[in-house]
Interface confidence: low
């Protein structure tokens, strides 16, 4: 079989809410993937599993099932949303994200995604990892690629 290419494009939007009492931040992060099928037969995108890490801690997970079928030599753009929670031992971030004296409250998150495709009864998994900036202080819609954090090293928090 020819390759199935998965390209993580970036964060599409991040919607934020807070629990003042619990000093907790809720971020619903919608990401965009391009999946290209270089085969001459359709492949099924069986599932997408994603997780988001902040400072090496998993803050959100999501799984989508039976997503789509991608035709031969075709590409589909797929959006998926990961609900994340920044709380407990990371509640110190609540102060940063709600600080009104700064305009942009960017935090660096690591997006991990695994796409499982099937064809002719075979399964194939392709994984990607990307660091992305997300504003935890307001609802934000991003132009694709705008949120990329280009430093390949794990950033210090």
């Amino acid at each position: 079989p020819r390759s199935i290419d998965v390209k993580y494009i970036g964060v599409k939007s991040a919607y934020v809410s807070y629990d003042v009492q619990k000093r907790t931040i809720y971020l619903n992060i919608t990401n965009t993937l391009n999946i290209t099928n270089n085969n001459y037969y359709s492949v099924e995108v069986e599932n997408i599993t994603a997780q988001v890490q902040f400072s090496k801690t998993v803050i959100g997970k999501a799984r989508l099932n039976n997503i789509t079928i991608i035709g031969p030599l075709d590409m589909k753009q797929i959006d998926y949303t990961v609900p994340t929670v920044i709380a407990e031992e990371m509640s110190y971030m609540y102060d940063f994200c709600t600080l009104i004296s700064i305009k942009v409250h960017n935090i660096v998150l690591m997006m991990q995604v695994t796409v499982t495709t099937t064809y002719f009864g075979h399964s194939e998994q392709i994984s990607q990892e990307r660091y992305q900036y997300v504003d935890c202080g307001r609802n934000t819609t991003y132009q694709l690629g705008q949120s990329e954090y280009l430093n390949v090293l794990q950033p210090q928090q």
Epitope: R2, Y40, Y41, P72, T118
Partner: antibody, heavy 122, light 107 residues
């Protein structure tokens, strides 16, 4: 019923190019691939390449990458193969064929055009 | 590229006889193999797809099977219109490759 009607025979000069057409009818053109296959006189079949008429995406056998260009016109349900810098080696019958695509059947050419004879001669 | 070695290249047989043609794949192709028939006027028709599935309208005397990397087309009782050329085609990977063909001749 499904039909792939190819254009008529061509007699062309060396060094020129030729465009062969394959008009599809009896099915949804953009839901199937169109494959192209070459057959030299008295020889076997050789796969040239494939086009997805829906998006126009193509892929070619390495051997034909610089020789053949595949295109498709959705408005007329017609696929084309253009052969360039023709030599006597390009004298052959060219077939188009339809391929259903499905996760389970995969590439499985089910209907063939009648073939178009291209003769390269000075 | 996957090589498809088809044998025999020609075969003489009598009406009513049972014959088998074979294609050997150089790599694993699963069940992704077709058998094609080419008439003297050049017309190509698919007989068998996915190794053993018979196309609609194809007589039941044609059948396809597999044993390891060997794929066979069997004609149980030859009729006059069967004396043409047959090709196998693998569609497991790109580029698609054909067997060299078998010319079936009347004895």
């Amino acid at each position: 019923q499904v039909q792939l009607q190819q254009s008529g025979p061509e007699l062309v000069r060396p060094g020129t190019s030729v465009k062969v057409s394959c008009k599809a009818s009896g099915y949804a053109f953009t839901n199937y691939l169109i494959e192209w296959v070459k057959q030299r006189p008295g020889q076997g079949l050789e796969w040239i390449g494939v086009i997805n008429p829906g998006g126009g995406n193509t892929d070619y056998s390495e051997k034909f990458k610089d020789k053949a260009t595949l295109t498709a016109d959705k408005s007329s349900n017609t696929a084309y193969i253009q052969l360039s810098s023709l030599t006597s080696e390009d004298s052959a019958v060219y077939f188009c064929a339809r391929s259903p695509y499905s996760s389970y059947v995969g590439y499985a050419v089910d209907y063939w055009g009648q073939g178009t004879s291209v003769t390269v001669s000075s | 590229d996957i090589q498809m070695t088809q044998s025999p290249s020609s075969l003489s047989a009598s009406l009513g006889e049972r014959v088998s043609l074979t294609c050997r794949a150089s790599q694993d192709i699963g069940s992704n193999l077709n058998w094609l028939q080419q008439e003297p006027d050049g017309t190509i028709k698919r007989l068998i797809y996915a190794t053993s599935s018979l196309d609609s309208g194809v007589p039941k005397r044609f059948s396809g099977s597999r044993s390891g990397s060997d794929y066979s087309l069997t004609i149980s009782s030859l009729e006059s219109e069967d004396f043409v050329v047959y090709y196998c085609l693998q569609y497991a990977s790109s580029p698609r490759t054909f067997g060299g063909g078998t010319r079936l001749e009347i004895k």
